[in-house]
Interface confidence: medium
């Protein structure tokens, strides 16, 4: 995350780390015990093997993501449709081996309702414990940063994104730049709060460079996704 | 959930199992037409800010809130299940109807042991003029950003 | 005000096991983890490890792994050491303390009031 | 794990001097702009008191004459002007990775 702030504890309790090899690679988002919504691109092969990844909830420091606090992934879904080209439908679901304990740190998200309304520069939030610059290195702690969505019309003009973004992605960030999500925070959360509760609008998923000006954050529109992802919870079930 | 799959038309539905597409009016209809059976297991949903329950109807060919009348909890639980949730039922609650909805699902008590939908009938009316806001998981509180002081 | 009050002082015969408590007062126990660190008289402090209330997941420094087991009762807000096997090198004052969990900046605002413990036949 | 290493052992300092305690760490404890060095005083019979955390944060209640600076594995304790009351055992803290570790302690003595 670039140009946030560090995360206090049980701020956001649906942020999980994914590591590969006691690596952090990617984010994700709790929404039940047992699943996490993550990015497409973060599961491509060969990582679309379970075995790979272990998540890490409610711990805000990479340092203290040791073995034996992770939970092992059973199940990796990537969305049918995902084309690794454009990004477009860039949404993967993870099964855990073990459900999560909730608690003050650990909690789920909501998934969107259908009906929800979103205001065009609607306040949300990003976090991740990716790069805090462009090029830059993993971020030992969670950050996380307001960003205003920002309307596809808008984010698809020709000194923007030039026609890129699909109805199955939302652009978020400021058009001067200085605020955005950045590589590693990839598969994590773009949350807002509605009715006093806080809700996954997004997942992030691409954007060229990170927090330049007219190049705001890409995201996953979860609003498209929510009935893909209850069929998947439903069939597993 | 807008039940327009890429390979049909604005009027069809698509059956995930096969991407075959399948008429509006047969979808929850108690009758599986595709072959997964996901016409039949896609019949609730939760709509809005509020966690609205609806259902769909096959007759209307659209999606109406359940009324409050005769609802509890075991009912809540079967829609949470029907959902994709397991085990993790939260709370079900009456909640004033603001949407001028004219046209409701109201619950046929008399039925017999079947999904939950099936239990359900076409109403234009709803005696508590109240209507279902389920939640199927505790979601979306985080611990206030204000910390106690030291 | 945050408090940490600990169990008082304990004579106990080699290869018993001891039990220390440390009540937790004056703020939410389940947002914050307690840590336990020993002090043998005269020396420095070594970290035994954790324990988060919110969850009750626990880390223990290696070195403790077998010898100190850390529980929490919410209900009453209490965290708990137990000392097993005891031995004339476990005679140190054991102290609670309390830390940020996850942002774990890992430093001690709040400390308990200590309890010595004697092994001695 | 990071080993700490404190100097000077013990040091006498007059009143009113300046007392400066190094703490040295066996690898960096600094990274995503933190440096994860706490300080602590401790005097007989009491438990450790927090003075400085993340190598130059001054808790709350702790008197200014107290300060800390440092990052990467060099980290200073200052206190200055020196006051009776600060007759103690200082101890340094890292927090980078598990387990945490504290550094031997130096005593602070009054001439």
């Known amino acids: 995350i670039v140009g946030g702030e560090s995360a206090l504890p049980g701020a956001w309790p649906w942020q999980v780390s994914l590591h590969v090899q006691n690596v952090h690679v990617c984010g994700g988002s709790i929404i039940t015990p047992e699943w996490i919504v993550t990015a497409a691109h973060c599961v491509e092969k060969p990582l679309n093997n379970p075995w790979h990844w272990t998540a890490f909830a409610g711990i805000l420091r990479q340092s203290f993501m040791f073995y034996g606090a992770g939970y092992q992934v059973e199940k990796v879904i990537s969305h049918p449709n995902y084309d690794s080209k454009t990004k477009n439908n860039d949404i993967a679901l993870m099964k855990l081996q073990k459900p999560l304990t909730f608690n003050d740190l650990v909690k789920p998200v909501c998934l969107p309702n259908p009906g929800m309304m979103l205001q065009p520069e609607q306040l949300c939030w990003i976090s991740g414990w990716g790069a805090t610059e462009e090029k830059g290195k993993t971020s030992e702690v969670l950050n996380a940063a307001k960003v205003l969505l920002i309307e596809t019309q808008r984010c698809n003009s020709r000194y923007v994104y030039d026609n890129l973004i699909t109805p199955a992605m939302i652009c978020a960030g400021f058009l001067q730049g200085n605020v955005d999500s950045c590589q590693g925070d990839s598969g994590g959360p773009l949350v807002t709060s509605k009715n006093n509760i806080w809700w996954l609008i997004g997942d992030t998923s691409w954007g060229s460079g990170c927090a330049k000006a007219y190049r705001p954050g890409v995201y996953g529109n979860v609003m498209v996704f929510t009935d893909w992802i209850y069929r998947q919870m439903r069939a597993d079930g | 959930w807008k039940f327009m799959g890429s390979k049909c038309s604005n009027s069809g539905i698509e059956c995930d199992s096969s991407g075959t597409c399948i008429n509006p009016s047969n979808w929850c209809d108690g009758v599986s037409h595709c072959p997964g059976g996901e016409d039949e297991n896609r019949c609730v949903r939760l709509y809005g800010p509020n966690f609205i329950l609806q259902v769909y109807s096959s007759q209307r060919k659209s999606w109406h809130p359940v009324c409050q009348d005769d609802w509890s909890e075991g009912y809540g639980r079967a829609a949470c299940q029907d959902m994709g949730y397991r085990n993790s039922f939260y709370s079900s609650q009456g909640i004033v109807d603001d949407s001028g909805s004219t046209s409701f699902m109201k619950l046929n008590t008399s039925a017999g042991n079947v999904d939950i939908y099936k239990k359900l009938y076409h109403s234009d009316a709803c005696s508590s003029k109240a209507v279902v806001s389920l939640r199927c998981i505790a979601c979306g509180v985080n611990l206030n950003s204000s910390r106690q002081s030291r | 005000q945050v408090q940490l009050q600990q169990s008082g002082p304990a004579l106990v015969k080699p290869g018993a096991s001891l039990k220390i408590s440390c009540e937790a007062s004056?703020?939410?126990?389940?947002?914050?983890?307690i840590n336990w660190v020993k002090q043998r008289p005269g020396q420095g402090l070594e970290w035994i490890g954790w324990?988060?209330?919110?969850?009750?997941?626990?880390y223990y420094n290696e070195k403790f792994k077998g010898k100190a087991t850390l529980t929490i009762d919410k209900s009453s807000s209490t965290a708990y050491m137990l000392l097993s096997s005891l031995t004339s090198e476990d005679s140190a004052v054991y102290f609670c303390?309390?830390?940020?969990?996850?942002?774990?900046?890992?430093?001690?605002?709040?400390w308990g009031t200590g309890t010595t413990v004697t092994v001695s036949s | 794990d990071i080993v700490l290493t404190q100097s000077p052992a013990s040091l006498a300092v007059s009143l009113g001097q300046r007392a400066t305690i190094s703490c040295r760490a066996s690898?960096?404890?600094?990274?995503?702009?933190?440096?994860?060095m706490h300080w602590y005083q401790q005097k007989p019979g009491q438990p450790p008191k927090l003075l400085i955390y993340l190598a130059s944060n001054l808790e709350s209640g702790v008197p200014a004459r107290f300060s800390g600076s440092g990052s990467g594995t060099d980290f200073t304790l200052n206190i200055h002007p020196v006051e009776e009351e600060d007759a103690a055992t200082y101890y340094c803290?890292?927090?980078?990775?598990?387990?945490?570790?504290f550094g031997a302690g130096t005593k602070l003595e009054l001439k």
């Open positions: 324990i988060f209330p919110g969850s009750g997941s626990t």
């Open positions: 004056g703020y939410t126990f389940t947002y914050y983890s």
């Open positions: 803290q890292h927090s980078r990775d598990l387990p945490l570790t």
């Open positions: 303390a309390r830390s940020d969990y996850g942002s774990a900046y890992g430093y001690f605002d709040v």
């Open positions: 690898k960096s404890v600094s990274t995503s702009g933190y440096s994860y």
